[in-house]
Amino acid sequence: ELCDDDPPEIPHATFKAMAYKEGTMLNCECKRGFRRIKSGSLYMLCTGNSSHSSWDNQCQCTSSATRNTTKQVTPQPEEQKERKTTEMQSPMQPVDQASLPGHCREPPPWENEATERIYHFVVGQMVYYQCVQGYRALHRGPAESVCKMTHGKTRWTQPQLICTGEMETSQFPGEEKPQASPEGRPESETSCLVTTTDFQIQTEMAATMETSIFTTEYQ
């Protein structure tokens, strides 16, 4: 029931789960100079019964006694923005979110935890995308992805989102409704949704990847 891959990578976007399905694992990772305590948990696990879900195990980090010989690369702040955002989650929980049956909330931070959280999601998990600061969201539909089981194999659905740099926004008039612009669909069927972002997406389902083709550039 664990999802084989990470959620899709959308350039210039990060994703977040608002709640974590039971069975989700969170690696107990420590920041540089710290390590898991001996006999400490490798991961936290979202478990529960019919009425309540919570994280089993506790992550604990202690100061590294010996120098770590494995090379670690800490990205610079600018690099971090553009890094693959899969599994990178903010420990902030939106205050307005109602709790969901069979789901855990965002685990609170533990002392000296790593800057990135690595989750292992299960089938049925939904994650939501947002463009990073400085990028504008162009939507064909919801900016979400669900891990689903198809023919015994897990896959994530494709978020209907593109994040474009502010300097490119003139290509996508948000104020005017364009004449019905053709648009692709994630399941490669015809669409009749009209969007004010005036762009076209073609979907290569064979690779379950989306290629963005902007009408202003290529037509």
Epitope: Q97, M126, P142, E144
Partner: antibody, heavy 119, light 106 residues
Framework: QVQLVESGGGVVQPGGSLRLSCAVS????????IQWVRQAPGKGLEWVSV???????NYNSALMSRFTISKDNSKSTLYLQMNSLRAEDTAVYYC?????????????WGQGTLVTVSS | DIQMTQSPSSLSASVGDRVTITCRAS?????MHWYQQKPGKAPKPLIF???NLASGVPSRFSGSGSGTDYTLTISSLQPEDFATYYC?????????FGGGTKLEIK
């Protein structure tokens, strides 16, 4: 506490205009998309439009030439401007918010506002 | 547009019955959401992404399905479950709802 409250409904003549409002609280319109869904008397639900957190919009193609969705983030208010109204636009109009950011699953709904188009 | 066909359109059942409502999409969709609506009230979220329960929804409700066929099951009907149920997809544009299934007391 997430809340959405619609207003602006009423009786309007065919060909007339109406602007619906949806005042939200407990969250920011800069983080979540809001959708309009309508329901004609005794009928099912019909999706109308969405304005996403970043401001981009999608419409039901059958309605887009007459309806315009907009928002004022600072006032935490969403609007639906409806022009050239027809009898078939008579419905309860709901604004609704997804559970997560710009998601599809509508976890929070307003109480609805009734629009009656009649001469 | 993807058409969502719910069956049955209406259903009479008794408290304690097991009830299944089906939603068939005209083309394959990735997942389905379900809502419950009572007369004069706004729809209430029930199930999201095919099988996840919404907040406050009792465990007697469950959802399943894939491709074009999805089901909502109520394992043991309670008096408060008599209402109209709608499915919704947004795997493809535009988002569409099923026509509804009205669940009435026998």
């Amino acid at each position: 506490q997430v809340q959405l409250v619609e207003s602006g409904g009423g009786v309007v003549q065919p060909g007339g205009s109406l602007r619906l409002s949806c005042a939200v609280s407990g969250f920011s319109l800069t983080s979540y998309g809001i959708q309009w869904v309508r329901q004609a008397p005794g009928k099912g639900l019909e999706w109308v439009s969405v304005i996403w957190a970043g401001g981009s919009t999608n419409y039901n193609s059958a309605l887009m030439s007459r309806f315009t969705i907009s928002k004022d983030n600072s006032k935490s208010t969403l609007y639906l401007q409806m022009n050239s109204l027809r009898a078939e636009d008579t419905a309860v109009y709901y604004c609704a918010r997804a559970y997560g950011y710009d998601g599809s699953w509508l976890a929070y709904w307003g109480q609805g506002t009734l629009v009656t188009v009649s001469s | 547009d993807i058409q969502m066909t719910q069956s049955p359109s209406s259903l009479s059942a008794s408290v304690g019955d097991r009830v299944t409502i089906t939603c068939r999409a005209s083309s394959s969709v990735s997942y389905m959401h379900w809502y419950q609506q009572k007369p004069g009230k706004a729809p209430k979220p029930l199930i999201f992404a095919t099988s996840n329960l919404a907040s406050g929804v009792p465990s007697r409700f469950s959802g399943s399905g894939s491709g074009t066929d999805y089901t909502l099951t109520i394992s043991s009907l309670q008096p408060e479950d008599f209402a109209t149920y709608y499915c919704q997809q947004w795997s493809s544009n535009p988002p569409t709802f099923g026509g509804g299934t009205k669940l009435e007391i026998k």
